[in-house]
Interface confidence: low
């Protein structure tokens, strides 16, 4: 009976050993599968995150497009109204003009002498820009960049005058130090009778026939 028990015990030990090995193998297999599943989960997760990011970006882009469309529709209907009303009243800015504080501004990308720039603005039912405040100055500078740009200020007929009749003496001024100086040393004949923004935004007087960029301005009528 003892020998039988010994055999049974040996058999049990063997079975247990086999079971342990088998269990370890299964655990290892499960662990490998788990890692694989984990990796796949991470992959799916990152794909989902990317898709979500893309969707958010698409949504933002779509919102921008919708806003732009709404703005364009408003602008177009306003243009149509202005067109039907023979352009006598303007409650919105023409296309490609920028609205700021009740005025519309157009920034040239080409260059012309002051007189030609002035004529151009007049043909657009506007005038060369008249700068009346520090805020307007900053707004213009943000849109122009560091470029010499004509403004609607000249002393060709005597004292300095704004083209729209705004009072020069009591109004906003932003000359560079020692300007205007009516400099004759340029050798182009005469002095300097037209004002422009210099690269840092302060004003200088220069020879009117120099070709610089320019800005046109027109006031918006109050909407009823």
């Amino acid at each position: 009976q003892n020998s039988q028990l010994r055999e049974d015990l040996l058999a049990l030990r063997q079975n247990f050993s086999n079971l342990t090995v088998s269990t370890e193998d299964q655990v290892k297999a499960l662990s490998t599968q788990g890692s694989s599943v984990g990796r796949k989960m991470k992959l799916v997760e990152s794909k989902l995150e990317k898709q979500q990011k893309d969707l958010t970006e698409d949504h933002s882009s779509l919102l921008l497009h919708v806003k732009q469309l709404v703005s364009d529709v408003r602008s177009l209907s306003c243009q149509m109204a202005a067109f039907r009303g023979n352009g006598s009243e303007r409650t919105c800015c023409p296309i490609n003009w920028v609205e700021y504080e009740g005025s519309c501004y157009w920034f040239s990308s080409s260059v012309r002498p002051w007189t030609e720039a002035d004529k151009y603005c007049q043909l657009e039912n506007a005038h060369l820009v008249v700068v009346t405040s520090r805020d307007e100055q900053n707004f213009l500078q943000r849109h122009m960049g560091p470029l010499n740009t004509w403004i609607g200020l000249t002393d060709q007929n005597g004292p300095w005058k704004w083209v729209d009749g705004t009072d020069y003496e009591t109004g906003f001024q932003n000359w560079r130090p020692e300007q205007p100086d009516n400099w004759y040393g340029h050798g182009l004949g005469g002095g300097e009778d037209c004002a422009h923004f210099t690269t840092d935004g302060r004003w200088n007087d220069d020879v009117c026939r120099r070709p610089y960029r320019w800005v046109c301005e027109t006031k918006l009528d109050k909407a009823n």
Epitope: R134, Q137, N138, Q141, R142, G145, P146, L147, N174, R176, H186, T198, T199, D200, G201, R202, N204
Partner: nanobody
């Protein structure tokens, strides 16, 4: 990367002269107006002079007019400040500065490390 490196500072007697230089790199030098600004010990920044991109137009603070001359050599990307008839009150750290062409009430966007000018007997 914009870099402005001043040199030429030092100790000088009243009535003496110095020439400051500023070597510029990292941007198209001849596209921008440049200037000099100084800071005396315990004082705020004081605009000294600036010069247009071409070098045609130059501007000076009243305190240095007739004594200082700003100039530039666009072929060497270098800005200069010739200082004559120096006075004790000219003692300061002198900074070379690039004008940003954007906001008139803060016209400088890059500054050098500065060079110290001491006027003393």
């Amino acid at each position: 990367e914009v870099q402005l490196l001043e040199s030429g500072g030092g100790l000088v007697q009243p009535g003496g002269s110095l020439r400051l230089s500023c070597a510029a790199s990292g941007f198209t030098f001849n596209d921008y107006d440049m200037g000099w600004v100084r800071q005396a010990p315990g004082k705020g920044l004081e605009w000294v002079s600036d010069i247009s991109s071409t070098g045609r137009a130059t501007y000076y603070a009243d305190s240095v007019k007739g004594r200082f001359t700003i100039s530039r050599d666009n072929s060497k990307n270098t800005l200069y400040l010739q200082m004559n008839s120096l006075r004790a009150e000219d003692t300061a750290v002198y900074y070379c500065a690039k004008m940003n062409g954007k906001y008139y009430d803060d016209p400088f966007d890059y500054w050098g490390q500065g060079t110290l000018v001491t006027v003393s007997s």
